[in-house]
């Protein structure tokens, strides 16, 4: 269970308990909310008792015997109200949440395009990256623009495992590697020299790179080839 | 009079103190029950090896698994027999792929490979059944009537299926449903 919320309420408590108004999103959160209320109440109780102990002598000096009792009753009354609210919250909320969860899970099951996490709908997630697996064929430059319009980059491959995975998903696709001519080095989209072996590099006409089943090949930048986009999480 | 007032206040504070204590113990019990309920309530457990993502109506997959439409898929690069594949998926707290529809794996639709899926023929029910015991929809693979019932089914994500000896080695796909 994520106890961050509890730690937060212990250490970084704001002057007034507005956090309690936050709507719990789920069962876990509703319990956290209640824990925060309790922690806040306990902190207030400690503070109040400290105040009371500190001012004890002055009350007696002024000879107002009912004042401390009134203060205690007031504090206890507030604590009772808070505790009562907590009990009601904990009794009422889970049942409505379960109901809501059951309804939403029914709805979600019927949706076709459910999607995961931080990736756009219809993208796939793999090893902390989102991938748009395109089916359309484009030139290298068109592919670059298409990915940019999707707030992502033309496919880049960081390691062997990712390359093998992408080769399984799709037999060939553009990658974000190019050169200005055969006399220039292959570079990535951020201008770094690209050292991985690219087959057919000696052909002066082929200045854009393609992933093709576990190897990289050079291709004509004007060829229409499937493209994929990538966005690191 | 002052003494009476003091006694009254003490009585009230005593009563409130007792109420506070009882409310506190009630709250403690309720919290304990809620946590217990949380740990055994299946509706709230996202499943093995999966962690809930923050700010998400969905969940994240294990490393080296693909997340797509709230499912996690393990796409093997190794080739195994159908039974080996089934056991490997089970060891990952998942099962061999059960298809809801033929475009379920449309992110792999340009793949040329065939993969073992969780479909086998039940002599007892005289029907093709998925791993969970549900029957194969006749609309999923139009050619399923021609499948050899002694064989297992390999599927290509562009929608084709074929029957092969269960002892043949193929790649396989495991699936974990997150919802």
């Amino acid at each position: 269970m994520d106890n961050q919320g509890v730690i937060y309420s212990d250490l970084n408590l704001p002057p007034n308990p507005k956090r309690q108004q936050r709507k719990p999103k789920g069962n876990k959160n509703s319990i956290l909310a209640t824990e925060q209320e309790i922690t806040y109440a306990e902190l207030n109780l400690q503070k109040a008792s400290q105040d009371f102990q500190g001012n004890d002598k002055t009350y007696h000096c002024k000879d107002l015997p009912s004042a401390p009792e009134k203060l205690i009753v007031g504090i206890l009354g507030i604590i009772c109200l808070i505790l009562m609210a907590s009990v009601v919250t904990i009794v009422v909320i889970p049942s409505t949440l379960i109901q809501r969860h059951n309804n939403s899970s029914l709805n979600t099951r019927t949706q076709k395009a459910r999607h995961c996490g931080h990736c756009p709908e219809e993208w796939i997630t793999y090893s902390n990256s989102c991938y748009y697996i395109g089916k359309e064929r484009r030139t290298w430059e068109e592919s670059l623009l298409a990915c940019t319009s999707k707030n992502s980059s033309l496919l880049s491959i960081d390691n062997e495992e990712e390359m093998k995975f992408l080769s399984i998903i799709s037999p060939s696709s553009w990658i974000g590697v190019f050169r200005n001519s055969s006399h220039h080095p292959w570079v990535t989209m951020n201008g770094l020299a690209f050292k991985h072996e690219i087959k057919d590099s000696d052909n002066a006409e082929l200045n854009c790179a393609v992933l093709q089943v576990n190897r990289l090949k050079s291709a004509q930048c004007g060829s229409s080839i499937i493209y994929h986009c990538k966005h690191k999480l | 009079m002052a003494v009476f007032k003091t006694t009254l206040w003490r009585l009230i504070s005593g009563t409130l103190g007792i109420i506070c204590l009882s409310l506190m113990s009630t709250l403690g019990i309720l919290l304990k029950n809620s946590f217990t309920k949380l740990s055994i309530e299946p509706a709230f457990t996202p499943g093995p090896n999966i962690e809930l993502q923050k700010d998400s109506d969905c969940c994240s997959c294990q490393e080296k698994w693909v997340g797509y439409r709230c499912n996690c898929y393990f796409i093997s690069s190794e080739q195994k027999t159908w039974n080996e594949s089934r056991h490997l998926c089970a060891s990952q707290k998942s099962s061999l792929l059960q298809l809801q529809n033929t475009d379920e794996l449309d992110f792999m639709s340009s793949s040329q490979q065939f993969y073992w899926i969780g479909l086998s023929y039940s002599e007892e029910h005289t029907a093709w059944l998925w791993e969970n015991g549900s029957a194969l929809s006749q609309y999923l693979f139009p050619s399923f009537e021609t499948f050899n019932t002694k064989n297992c089914i390999a599927y290509n994500p562009n929608g084709n299926a074929l029957d092969e000896s269960c002892e043949d080695k193929n790649r396989y796909i495991c699936k974990q449903q997150l919802i």
Epitope: R179, S182, P185, W186, F194, K195, H196, E197, L216 | -
Partner: antibody, heavy 121, light 107 residues
Framework: EVQLQQSVAELVRPGASVKLSCTAS????????MHWVKERPEQGLEWIGR????????EFAPKFQGKATLTTDTSSNTAYLQLSSLTSEDTAIYYC??????????????WGQGTLVTVSA | DILMTQSPPSMSVSLGDTVSITCHAS??????IGWLQQKPGKSFKGLIY???NLEDGVPSRFSGSGSGADYSLTISSLESEDFADYYC?????????FGGGTKLEIK
């Protein structure tokens, strides 16, 4: 076609320096790493070092640090090995090699034909 | 430095035989090994990279295997052009180091 062309032989005096060249064709040296290896009949093969022609970064075997200098000229697609303060121990065949580098797998796919360096008075 | 111990230093074999040459590294090298061929008076040619992968144009009778610190090159059904010197090279860490070589001779 990938080729690495080296000069055939060099005869040099002890204490002098020599600069060996390795001209590549069929690929751009900036896209790979260029290595140099020393071969002597009794000692076998010894790796001297490598250079990244894209930025001039070098790695050396400890015994060749100070003895060998690696440079490149990207305009002529050529890698150079300079050996200084030559002694009879430096008499050997020197090979240049192109590193194959591809997502975790390395190796030498292509080699020059070697330059025989003879240090003699 | 990683020491590469190659064996045997030489072997006499017949055409059609299957031979294995082994290399032992002084520490684990995680398949970061290549195998090279050198014909008399000629330069080197890469045969195998990353322990098991064949370089382009290398016949399939050559194969590499092994893990950890022990690796081998196997040549099945030897042909006349296979009689040459063979070396292993490790590239797990700098400096790269070579085995002492194996001379394959016709019996």
């Amino acid at each position: 076609e990938v080729q690495l062309q080296q000069s055939v032989a060099e005869l040099v005096r002890p204490g002098a320096s020599v600069k060996l060249s390795c001209t590549a064709s069929g690929f751009n040296i900036q896209n790979t790493y260029m290595h140099w290896v020393k071969e002597r009949p009794e000692q076998g093969l010894e790796w001297i070092g490598r250079i990244d022609p894209a930025n001039g970064d070098t790695e050396f075997a400890p015994k060749f640090q100070g003895k060998a200098t690696l440079t490149t000229d990207t305009s002529s697609n050529t890698a150079y090995l300079q050996l200084s303060s030559l002694t009879s121990e430096d008499t050997a065949i020197y090979y240049c090699g192109r590193e194959r580098y591809f997502y975790g797998s390395r190796g030498f796919a292509y080699w020059g034909q070697g330059t025989l360096v003879t240090v003699s008075a | 430095d990683i020491l590469m111990t190659q064996s045997p230093p030489s072997m006499s074999v017949s055409l059609g035989d299957t031979v294995s040459i082994t290399c032992h590294a002084s520490q684990g090298i995680s398949s970061n090994i290549g195998w090279l061929q050198q014909k008399p008076g000629k330069s080197f040619k890469g045969l195998i990279y990353h322990g098991t992968n064949l370089e382009d144009g290398v016949p399939s009778r050559f194969s590499g295997s092994g893990s950890g610190a022990d690796y081998s090159l196997t040549i099945s059904s030897l042909e006349s052009e296979d009689f040459a010197d063979y070396y292993c090279v490790q590239y797990a860490q700098f400096p790269w180091t070579f085995g002492g070589g194996t001379k394959l001779e016709i019996k």
